[in-house]
């Protein structure tokens, strides 16, 4: 425990030092005798509420509202040209595509492309040189159980987010699955039993890992439920950075 | 951390009595600072409902007990000066803040700050130079449904972990949401129908992505349910590393 | 898509991506390991197969990654679990799933959890379920440190190169 690291390393304390040591020791003992039982009792008293009162939403409504704004317009800055001129990197943020699809924004807000990386929704992300890249992705999902059903839980939905290599220099073969994550959500039906929509649920499916990529290979994200993607700011993004 | 605000502000203590008083006071304070958190963590570790081992026996009891100790004292090392001296990086580990808040530890255990990165709970993480940073965060949550309710599932709770930028070159405006994860948990009520607390649930909300930051901008974590954070080792952390 | 069912695609086995010589920059220590799909009741890490590799000093010994030089490393790992729906007659048993990356170092007398995630899963009546856990962070590591993983729920792992992996790279 923490106290074990507190052993004295100096020589023997004498005279006045002994008195100080005695005072320190006594004080420490008394403090321990008082502090430990009181703390034990306090913690035991608090544990149930602490673990159980968990169901109320304590989130600051202001913060929530701000988060909920999604793509609020911020003063747009061009990424400075002098930032990391030699490092192929990209960060793309999810944006709704016509027809309920998931598209990606490469220049707005926090998104950027550096050092020759190229991106478009149709082509995906192309890295400008051979190398070892750390690829990452997070997709936020949201939804609610549709009306109906006798059980308190609706039909499960399994959300998958996957990162593939395809096209370009990789060629026309089967796109190669690089990294993927998945989450099964079982929405709660209308708790009031009014056969209405269930409460909103949220989840995020994310991952990241090292992949050796060649110049001209393309990387793209594939998701199972584009209609459930949460486009609120910061929730859905993917990117790459060369690390070797 | 909570203790950091306890620095003495008074003038110099004089005379032998003053010295004894100072020693007694300091010893008492140090003992309290060690005893109270250690006792809290020990009690939390031992309270039955607090660990998942009671819900299923697939969890390694040894590992569980070890996790439950949270901040047990490890041989503290100064980060070596020769470790990547030019690379601004930080890894901060979640620690309980007075009043059920989420604080961050910057020097204990695996936590570190290198190359001019600065951190305080009040102001967040400040990076020393312009650049491209990979920012990451993982917050472990835990809880149990409170007693009561006719349905087998309790009220849903949506857990959010968010990373914001503020201050510095970014200016005094609204903090900017950079990255965010969310997870809706619907706790299962007492399966035995005894109107007791439901079984413990666990989840983690994490993310990571590239962000272009300017010197002096501050990055901080905001979470929806600080009372539900799991402080077991390795569960809750955030950090940044400059990649270009 | 290939692997939509979270299984290795034919493409992965048919066309292994050749390793490239990174002539443009000095190699940095890096590793990416995948769970061995042939071992169903344990999580054994494999290198030098599919997209897994060990680079510039990293080695794999006793299912642990050995850190080649002191420095700051980004360490990451992912697992994906799956399971079947329970039958209406059965009592749904909660399932405890956990994944942890641990550090074993000469400086500590025990394995230190670096990255840890837990989940209680309540299998539903209707469909099979999937759950992934990913985490990654930067750590100051010392030459000779060992990085390993501990997983609860191994029988439920979906072992494929895209779903179960463990890696690290020097920054």
């Amino acid at each position: 425990m923490g106290a074990l690291g507190l052993e004295g390393r100096g020589g023997r304390l004498q005279g006045r030092g002994s008195l100080l040591l005695a005072v320190a020791g006594a004080t420490s003992l008394v403090t321990l005798l008082l502090a430990v039982p009181i703390t034990v009792l306090a913690v035991l008293a608090l544990v149930p509420q602490d673990q159980g009162g968990l169901v109320t939403d304590t989130a600051d409504p202001g913060a929530q509202a701000q988060q909920g704004l999604g793509f609020q317009k911020l003063p747009e800055e061009e990424p400075e040209a002098d930032l990391s001129p030699g490092l192929p990197a990209a960060h793309l943020i999810g944006a709704p595509l016509k027809g309920q699809g998931l598209g990606w924004e490469a220049t707005k807000e926090q998104a950027f492309l550096t050092s020759g990386t190229q991106f478009s929704d149709a082509e995906g992300l192309a890295l400008p040189q051979d190398g070892l890249y750390y690829l990452y992705c997070l997709v936020g999902y949201r939804g609610r159980a549709p009306p109906g059903g006798a059980e308190p839980r609706g039909r499960s939905v399994t959300l998958r987010s996957s990162l593939y290599r395809a096209g370009g220099a990789y060629g026309p073969g089967t796109p190669e699955l690089l990294l993927e994550g998945a989450e099964t959500v079982t929405p709660v039906l209308d708790p009031a039993g009014r056969q209405g929509y269930g409460p909103l649920w949220y989840t995020s499916v994310g991952f990241g890992g090292l992949v050796q990529l060649r110049r001209g290979e393309r990387v793209y994200v594939n998701i199972s439920h584009p209609d459930m993607v949460d486009f609120a700011r910061g929730k859905t993004f993917f990117g790459a950075v060369m690390v070797g | 951390m909570g203790a950091l605000g306890l620095e003495g502000r008074g003038g110099r203590l004089q005379g032998r009595g003053s010295l004894l008083l100072a020693v007694a006071g300091a010893t008492s304070l140090v003992t309290l600072l060690l005893a109270v958190p250690i006792t809290v963590l020990a009690v939390l570790a031992l309270v039955p409902q607090d660990q998942g081992g009671l819900v299923t026996d697939t969890a390694d009891p040894g590992a569980q007990a070890q996790q439950g100790l949270g901040f047990q004292k490890l041989p503290e090392e100064e980060p070596e000066a020769d470790l990547s001296p030019g690379l601004p990086a930080a890894h901060l580990i979640g620690a309980p803040l007075k009043g059920q808040g989420l604080g961050w530890e910057a020097t204990k255990e695996q936590a570190f700050l290198t190359s001019g990165t600065q951190f305080s709970d009040a102001e967040g993480l400040a990076l020393p130079q312009d650049g491209l940073y990979y920012l990451y965060c993982l917050v472990g949550y835990r809880g149990r449904a409170p007693p009561g309710g006719a349905e087998p599932r309790g009220r849903s709770v949506t857990l959010r972990s968010s990373l914001y930028r503020a201050g510095g070159a970014y200016g005094p405006g609204t903090p900017e949401l950079l990255l965010e994860g969310a997870e809706t948990v619907t706790p299962v009520l007492d399966p035995a129908g005894r109107q007791g607390y439901g079984p413990l649930w666990y989840t983690s909300v994490g993310f990571g992505g590239l962000v272009q930051l300017r010197r002096g901008e501050r990055v901080y974590v905001n979470i929806s349910h600080p009372d539900m954070v799991d402080f077991a080792r390795g569960k809750t952390f955030f950090g940044a590393v400059m990649v270009g | 898509l290939p692997g939509v069912g979270l299984t290795p695609s034919a493409a992965q086995t048919a066309r292994q991506h050749p390793k490239m010589h990174l002539a443009h920059s000095t190699l940095k220590p890096a590793a990416h390991l995948i769970g061995d799909p042939s071992k169903q009741n344990s999580l054994l890490w494999r290198a030098n197969t599919d997209r897994a590799f060990l680079q510039d000093g990293f080695s794999l010994s006793n299912n642990s990654l050995l850190v080649p030089t002191s420095g700051i490393y980004f360490v990451y790992s992912q697992v994906v679990f799956s399971g079947k729906a329970y039958s209406p007659k059965a009592t749904p048993t909660p399932l405890y799933l956990a994944h942890e990356v641990q550090l074993f170092s000469s400086q500590y007398p025990f394995h230190v959890p670096l990255l840890s995630s837990q989940k209680m899963v309540y299998p539903g009546l209707q469909e099979p379920w999937l759950h992934s856990m990913y985490h990654g962070a930067a750590f100051q590591l010392t030459q000779g440190d060992q990085l390993s993983t501990h997983t609860d729920g191994i029988p439920h792992l979906v072992l494929s190169p895209s779903t179960v992996f463990f890696g690290a790279f020097a920054l």
């Epitope: 998931l102 149709a122 082509e123 096209g167 370009g168 026309p172 998701i223 199972s224 | - | 939509v4």
Partner: antibody, heavy 116, light 107 residues
């Protein structure tokens, strides 16, 4: 063996719509994107758009966004293209082609003639 | 949109000849160039992707080269089965566009 079998020729009146199909076999249908092209008589090829059979996401050449609607039926491993408000300008041979960008297999083509 | 120009719309050559068909893009397409062969019956086949990579099953008599905006397809040792129209296509920037085609005939 990979095959893309397209539906037969169509003769339609101006202003009408037509739905042509491309039946895929011999490979995992959801594993590859499906592209559609058109070739007017004696002219070059034009790329209309592409659909992801896995989730129905589609990309269109802006020129065709109000002309074509791409859909898939996973159960029958068939891709469809509906052509709307046809004019004589839309008379052409329409091809489906499998691939993310380079298309390694093409259908035999479907001839659409718009005439009153 | 990126314009693809095949300056030679038709050419004729003798069996055994070496033939080069060129293609120019209106802007840099970073090697994202594909070549297709369309036979007189309308059948279309992929020959080359990413400027120079030969698609499986395509004879090595076919080769591609180029960079930036200028690309070419070369057929060596011309055979009767090579009679077709050859199209280049850029897949660098959406929407993808094809060249006008080059019709190859045997003298």
């Amino acid at each position: 063996e990979v095959q893309l079998q397209q539906s037969g020729p169509e003769l339609v009146k101006p202003g009408a719509s037509v739905k042509i199909s491309c039946k895929a076999s011999g490979y995992s249908f959801t594993g590859y994107f499906m592209n559609w092209m058109r070739q007017s008589h004696g002219k070059s090829l034009e790329w209309i758009g592409r659909i992801n059979p896995y989730n129905g996401d589609s990309f269109y050449n802006q020129k065709f966004k109000d002309k074509a609607t791409l859909t898939v039926d996973k159960s029958s491993t068939t891709a469809h293209m509906e052509l709307l408000s046809l004019t004589s300008e839309d008379s052409a041979v329409y091809y489906c082609g499998r691939g993310y960008d380079a298309m390694d297999y093409w259908g035999q083509g479907t001839s659409v003639t718009v005439s009153s | 949109d990126i314009q693809m120009t095949q300056t030679t719309s038709s050419l004729s050559a003798s069996l055994g000849d070496r033939v080069t068909i060129s293609c120019r893009a209106s802007q840099d397409i970073s090697n994202f160039l594909t070549w297709y062969q369309q036979k007189p019956d309308g059948t279309v086949k992929l020959l080359i992707y990413y400027t120079s990579k030969l698609h499986s099953g395509v004879p090595s008599r076919f080769s591609g080269s180029g960079s930036g905006t200028d690309y070419s397809l070369t057929i060596s040792n011309l055979e009767p089965g090579d009679i077709a129209t050859y199209y280049c296509q850029q897949v660098s920037k959406f929407p993808w566009t094809f060249g006008g085609g080059a019709k190859l005939e045997i003298k």
